[in-house]
Amino acid sequence: VPEKSVRWCAVSEHEATKCQSFRDHMKSVLPSNGPSVACVKKASHLDCIRAIAANEADAVTLDAGLVYDAYLAPNNLKPVVAEFYGSKEDPQTFYYAVAVVKKDSDFQMNQLRGRKSCHTGLGRSAGWNIPIGLLYCDLPEPRKPLEKAVANFFSGSCVPCADGTDFPQLCQLCPGCGCSTLNQYFSYSGAFKCLKDGAGDVAFVKHSTIFENLANKADRDQYELLCLDNTRKSVDEYKDCHLARVPSHTVVARSVGGKEDLIWELLNQAQEHFGKDKSKEFQLFSSPHGKDLLFKDSAHGFLKVPPRMDAKMYLGYEYITAIRNLREGTCPEAPTDECKPVKWCALSHHERLKCDEWSVNSAGKIECESAETTEDCIAKIMNGEADAMSLDGGFVYIAGMCGLVPVLAENYNTPNPNCENTAEEGYFAVAVVKSSSDLTWDNLKGKKSCHTAVGRTAGWNIPMGLLYSKINHCRFDEFFSEGCAPGSEKNSSLCKLCMGPSPNLCEPNNKEGYYGYTGAFRCLVEKGDVAFVKHQTVPQNTGGKNPDAWAKNLKEEDYELLCLDGSRKSVQEPANCHLARAPNHAVVARKDKADCVQTLLLDQQRMFGSSVTDCSSNFCLFESKTKDLLFRDDTVCLAKLHDRNTYEKYLGEEYVKAVTNLRKCSTSPLLEACTF
């Protein structure tokens, strides 16, 4: 059956032979209605990429550099399956390119000019492409030929395989630049030896190199890693201090109609039958015909790449930046230490309009990027299409797991002028009911619930976390009879109560009328039994404070809070009747942009923050008539974090633990991708 066939692309006679053997052996173990293999032979990996894009083939396995080519338009391929190395219990699908230095040296990443460098080899990922790509814009002009620019940047180097005649400085530390193990400084171990012997000041290798060459921890402690933020970390902290994370070897397919489920079904079956130590007749990860045919011989198996993970996310911002710099050879005109405009990520068109107005008023210091969901915005910040946004704590957690950092906190209670330097304790997550109802925390089963959105703190993580510990399962849509929790599956009972309008029904953005704090409260007013919101929501939308038709006549005393002990209290008493304390919303950014974002925002709030009294004739950053656009409307200021500058420190141990527990029930495709 053609639609059940995976056309594998082979790039040599030997690969084609192995592919035919793969096809025949799979036929013998799979049912006739299961997936099958067909083989397509092309002259090169690039030809395979083009063939897949043109629907003449379906899959091929590629190194990271080629995954980049495959992702570029017009190819638009995506990673679907990753080879893993190491054990099934601790599968490694990536390695980290690192810059290793001796502990007793005192320079940082931005002080490499004039140092001596050790490289694994010319044109190799960890040893050349990544470090030189990331340093590209610091190289002296002209940057072509690249080898000459690098030779003029460092005071001496060992770059195995370089042309020692044309670029003698590149071979200064290893005369002749031998391109094999005859050169003692060749490849990973060689580059590390070049540093160890004192020939070089920095070695560009992969994270495992240090461990493979120094079994003794005391010896490893003599070395450190250079981080991109111009700090240093110990060699075991490579996950937080690397030049780039590099995928090892990846199966790619078309982004649309790419048969990724079928490819996974095929490869999963293949590894069961013909994986490591499975069969004598045919081995997926070796071949009598040659090395690394179709798959790497060192691979131990396959892992499915999460569906939310596109090539940009898979390759990572640093890797793409490095390769793009090398390939395109373009650098910004502004010096790299100058802050470029900050691209704010706006959620759907309501936020985009406010962002546009901010952009006009900021004299171009703010630019705007849009996405339909918070997770899409986070992904855009990760890959450099956007720079920053303000997030509820639940999304600060997801953003943190995806490598972003908190930059400033929204403060709600501290009056100026101390606001900017005050760390607030947070706000209260509360459960609100109508005073006329007889509901308590203990009899919510079967009732109608209203949530700010799935994944948000007060509206989801805190109440559902508490509920989970009571009911011990994730079927929240069965616990409540119906509800509105924007971001739920469209056919779920937790979308039934949402108001839409239609194409935007249950979408986690302002196009859904019941989205956010005000939306969840409106849902309670109009349809629901309980709303999970922040403690300020009821006072902010009653007594005429919200002029919208549905809210203008509401009275605060018509609503009460549910306490965890089964009692109820007035909405004026959240300190004595709440579900938990929630961390304030916070601005997040990529690490490399954090300082610029902070500086710019502190400047912007001085002009457009809560000191502006007349928002009808001036732009106000923290005002959007109860819609919480870009920032919460009750924000007094954005405050410095001081030492709370990681998501764990910012959110606090208790909240991180609660959200981590709820991950059993996670419906976050982005979180799944970021923890792959």
């Epitope: 068109h349 309501h350 309009l353 406010k354 107005e357 006009v360 008023n361 004299a363 009808s616 004739s617 001036n618 732009f619 959007s624 008539k625 819609k627 656009l629």
Partner: nanobody, 117 residues
Framework: QVKLEESGGGLVQPGGSLRLSCAAS????????MAWYRQAPGKQRELVAG???????KYADSVKGRFTISRDNAKNTVYLQMHSLKPEDTAVYYC???????????WGQGTQVTVSS
């Protein structure tokens, strides 16, 4: 709420010019920001140019150097002068003072600009 009405659109050849006007039903002196947006068929509405109360301006990259936004507070009107028009400038052009557009999808009729030979 001030009502805004756009005019001045029309059919023009590539390279030609047009001047769009946005007349307000009341005073625009105290309006913080006014802007022109455009929407081409099947595309999202996008910011073309904006002007603050103090007169500072911002332009979309695609129109920089060709379009100029200005406001005449005495006449309660905002203008968009468009030069060197290109076929990709074809769209319905809308004016906004942002006072209602954040919250409701409140836009005027707009004025059609068609650039074609």
């Amino acid at each position: 709420q001030v009502k805004l009405e756009e005019s001045g659109g029309g059919l023009v050849q590539p390279g030609g010019s047009l001047r769009l006007s946005c007349a307000a039903s009341g005073s625009i002196v105290s309006i913080a920001t006014m802007a022109w947006y455009r929407q081409a068929p099947g595309k999202q509405r996008e910011l073309v140019a904006g002007i603050t109360r103090g007169g500072s301006t911002k332009y979309a990259d695609s129109v920089k150097g060709r379009f100029t936004i200005s406001r005449d507070n005495a006449k309660n009107t905002v203008y968009l002068q468009m030069h060197s028009l290109k076929p990709e400038d074809t769209a319905v052009y809308y004016c906004t003072d942002y006072s209602r557009t954040y919250y409701e999808d409140h836009w005027g009729q707009g004025t059609q600009v068609t650039v074609s030979s």
